[in-house]
């Protein structure tokens, strides 16, 4: 009798350990990726940024994958996505091609099944950066809550990539899972 | 027999109550701190803001500590940190020392073990606030996901503190724990 | 005896299924609402934006209600609230009434019990949008962590609504529940 009870309890314990693991959602995925300044494209055109750190300084990743410049979702869920993009120019680093700039960021989602890219969030500003000013700076922050499926990819596009601030506290993006899909 | 079964159930219940508490992560820490306008430093230089409310209006704190102008982490974990900083100037409050401003925020982390400060996030803009305009306003928002250890401290530095908007909806920062460290 | 044990186990299982549901916080509420461009007010005055999508494109809602232009809380808790508001103007769409603009967003909370509205977050900038420039753009992002009670309503007010960018990736707001109220 007692042995039988212990077996029953073991079943309860076992199922609840499973539930506990699931309640931690298989260890919630997250990523915080910081710009890799050694490989920032030049020019003023809109480009996809492909070089990001995922394992140094503030950069980290868990239960997500970084590959070919894209943050890949490994686990279905609702995620909070964010990006902080800083642009800067000092006259000692050269001249601006134009004083009228569109400083923009686009957070995009690509589905491999349907090879199309969609913009989830955008932000930025048109700026007049006079050539007579010694230093210019501008930051953009965007954030939002999105349903992401395993295999979908998040990437960052910016205008004027040559003006990006290469500091890890300046130019970064990330995601963390908040909840399962019902 | 029946008494023995109840004891077994109590053990199961007890252990799962513990697990439930842990699954709530000892009540997830958070803080939302709003600027204390009675003690904003003057000048245009970069300063650490030490006066924040933690228990009035929108300001609140739980399982974190506010001390000496810093938000102290009491529980290891991954946290989402954010800050919203508003700057404003009206001509009725006097002239600006200069029309060319760097309006910046820096969210910094200090470890007591290694007494050094590191910037986690920065944002802002260079601005031309003409003396001919009656009113100027500008807001910065930054946010990101960071690993924080118990005892680490979060603080806010800004340039031009005398231009800060003192409203609780304007100038604030905060944090909430998202998940444990594996 | 064996039947009695099974009944005890069923009680344990039942209570823990309840706890499991509660640990998922009755399925965490969230919303991501995107601007409905077919009904944006004109003018430059400050207005409440009442037309938002909740079920198309990136827009979605769960365990919250959208009614009369307001996001209604159905479940007490601490929520992260956010808004991203983009303003834009192209010379092909006509002249600006003034080149000096205040581009602002206010995230407000209304309690039905006490019919008063309070601003939780604000952001924006004064801008000089010269008539000599072909295109202008500016985005605001705000976010913060707030205690919300069932029945409370979140709404968005902006200045210069006629300048809003109608894209779903540009102008949106949202919320997700992070934790229960103790």
């Amino acid at each position: 009798g007692s042995q039988h009870i212990r077996a029953e309890k073991a079943m309860v314990d076992g199922s609840w350990l499973d539930l506990a693991k699931r309640s931690k959602l298989e260890a919630q995925p997250f990523a915080h990726l910081t710009i890799n300044a050694t490989d920032i494209p030049s020019g003023s055109h809109k480009v996809s940024l492909s070089s990001w750190y995922h394992d140094r300084g503030w950069a980290k990743i868990s239960n997500m994958t970084f590959s070919n410049g894209k943050l890949i979702v490994n686990q279905d869920g609702f995620y909070y996505l964010y990006a902080n993009i800083c642009f800067r120019h000092h006259e000692t680093s050269g001249d601006l091609a134009t004083e009228y700039l569109q400083l923009m960021v686009y957070v995009t989602k690509t589905s491999i099944k349907i090879p199309s890219s969609h913009t989830l969030m955008k932000g930025g500003s048109t700026k007049y950066w006079s050539g007579n000013s010694e230093f210019h700076f501008y930051s953009i922050n965007v954030g939002g809550f999105f349903k992401l499926r395993s295999g979908e990819e998040i990437s960052i596009e910016v205008s004027n990539p040559s003006l990006l601030d290469p500091d890890q506290d300046a130019t970064y993006f990330g995601a963390f899972k908040v909840r399962d899909i019902d | 027999g029946s008494q023995h079964i109840r004891a077994e159930k109590a053990m199961v219940d007890g252990s799962w109550l513990d697990l439930a508490k842990r699954s709530k992560l000892e009540a997830q820490p958070f803080a939302h701190l709003t600027i204390n306008a009675t003690d904003i430093p003057s000048g245009s230089h970069k300063v650490s803001l030490s006066s924040w409310y933690h228990d009035r209006g929108w300001a609140k704190i739980s399982n974190m500590t506010f001390s000496n102008g810093k938000l102290i982490v009491n529980q290891d974990g991954f946290y989402y940190l954010y800050a919203n900083i508003c700057f404003r100037h009206h001509e009725t409050s006097g002239d600006l020392a200069t029309e060319y401003l760097q309006l910046m925020v820096y969210v910094t982390k200090t470890s007591i073990k290694i007494p050094s400060s590191h910037t986690l996030m920065k944002g802002g803009s260079t601005k031309y606030w003409s003396g001919n305009s009656e009113f100027h306003f500008y807001s910065i928002n930054v946010g990101g996901f960071f690993k924080l250890r118990s005892g680490e401290e979060i603080s806010i530095e800004v340039s031009n503190p005398s231009l800060l908007d003192p409203d609780q909806d304007a100038t604030y920062f905060g944090a909430f724990k998202v998940r444990d460290i594996d | 005896g064996s039947q009695h044990i099974r009944a005890e186990k069923a009680m344990v299982d039942g209570s823990w299924l309840d706890l499991a549901k509660r640990s998922k916080l009755e399925a965490q509420p969230f919303a991501h609402l995107t601007i409905n461009a077919t009904d944006i007010p004109s003018g430059s005055h400050k207005v409440s934006l009442s037309s938002w999508y909740h079920d198309r494109g990136w827009a979605k809602i769960s365990n919250m209600t959208f009614s009369n232009g307001k996001l209604i809380v159905n479940q007490d808790g601490f929520y992260y609230l956010y808004a991203n508001i983009c303003f834009r103007h192209h010379e092909t769409s006509g002249d600006l009434a003034t080149e000096y603009l205040q581009l602002m967003v206010y995230v407000t909370k209304t309690s039905i019990k006490i019919p008063s509205s309070h601003t939780l977050m604000k952001g924006g900038s004064t801008k000089y949008w010269s008539g000599n420039s072909e295109f202008h753009f500016y985005s605001i992002n705000v976010g913060g962590f707030f205690k919300l009670r069932s029945g409370e309503e979140i709404s968005i007010e902006v200045s210069n609504p006629s300048l809003l960018d109608p894209d779903q990736d540009a102008t949106y707001f949202g919320a997700f529940k992070v934790r229960d109220i103790d």
Epitope: G94, D95, S130, N132 | Y100 | -
Partner: antibody, heavy 118, light 111 residues
Framework: QVQLVQSGAELKKPGASVKLSCKAS????????LQWVRQAPGQGLEWMGA????????KYTQKFKDRFTITADTSKSTAYMQLNSLKSEDSAVYYC???????????WGQGTLVTVSA | NIVLTQSPASLSVSLGQRATISCRAS??????????MHWYQQRPGQAPKLLIY???NLESGVPARFSGSGSRTDFTLTISSVEAEDEATYYC?????????FGGGTKLEIK
């Protein structure tokens, strides 16, 4: 170090065109405006215009706008200036130049003498 | 266009004496808290050489006897103690707005 090396002297007839080159080295060619300045014999310095290599943005003094063109070949880190419908008063030394890191024209080519004579 | 008027057109100074050259702009060349006025020296047969940038900053390698001052529309180049090698023509230039312009030049002769 920054160097600007210009092409050799030119003798042209009135009404003809001249194209001068300026090869840059010692810095990233696509990050600074390259300017052209001329100096007629015994006269002062006269700013003509400039180019931002890469996108090829240009700016010109009104006086020269109709017959003056500046171009650049980024693959060769070389800028060119062409002046059409030459007149005798276009006889001058033509300099290419670049600003210093903190303003002012710190770097000058050696100059190219253009003589316009029938 | 901003017109720069230099005076005098020429001056003769004894070795070791002070030389002062003036440059007046037809409108302010100040913006963003700085004065966009620069000074050059040109010796015969040579390209100009930058002496002073942004009204008062000494270019690297230029002797400390050269100095610049002024703001808005009135600027001065001073050589505190003239040396023989300073015999040259001096030009002011503004790059506050397009088109950039030069002054007519001042010829310095050493007595």
């Amino acid at each position: 170090q920054v160097q600007l090396v210009q092409s050799g002297a030119e003798l042209k007839k009135p009404g003809a065109s001249v194209k001068l080159s300026c090869k840059a080295s010692g810095y990233t060619f696509t990050t600074y405006w390259l300017q052209w300045v001329r100096q007629a014999p015994g006269q002062g310095l006269e700013w003509m215009g400039a180019i931002y290599p890469g996108p090829g943005n240009t700016k010109y003094t009104q006086k020269f706008k109709d017959r003056f063109t500046i171009t650049a070949d980024t693959s060769k880190s070389t800028a060119y200036m062409q002046l059409n419908s030459l007149k005798s008063e276009d006889s001058a030394v033509y300099y290419c130049a670049r600003r210093g890191s903190r303003r002012g024209i710190a770097y000058w080519g050696q100059g190219t003498l253009v003589t316009v004579s029938a | 266009n901003i017109v720069l008027t230099q005076s005098p057109a020429s001056l003769s100074v004894s070795l070791g004496q002070r030389a002062t050259i003036s440059c007046r702009a037809s409108e302010s060349v100040d913006s963003y808290g700085r004065s966009f006025m620069h000074w050059y020296q040109q010796r015969p047969g040579q390209a100009p050489k930058l002496l002073i940038y942004l009204a008062s900053n000494l270019e690297s390698g230029v002797p400390a006897r050269f100095s610049g001052s002024g703001s808005r529309t009135d600027f001065t180049l001073t050589i505190s103690s003239v040396e023989a090698e300073d015999e040259a023509t001096y030009y002011c230039q503004q790059d506050n707005e397009d088109p950039y312009t030069f002054g007519g030049g001042t010829k310095l002769e050493i007595k």
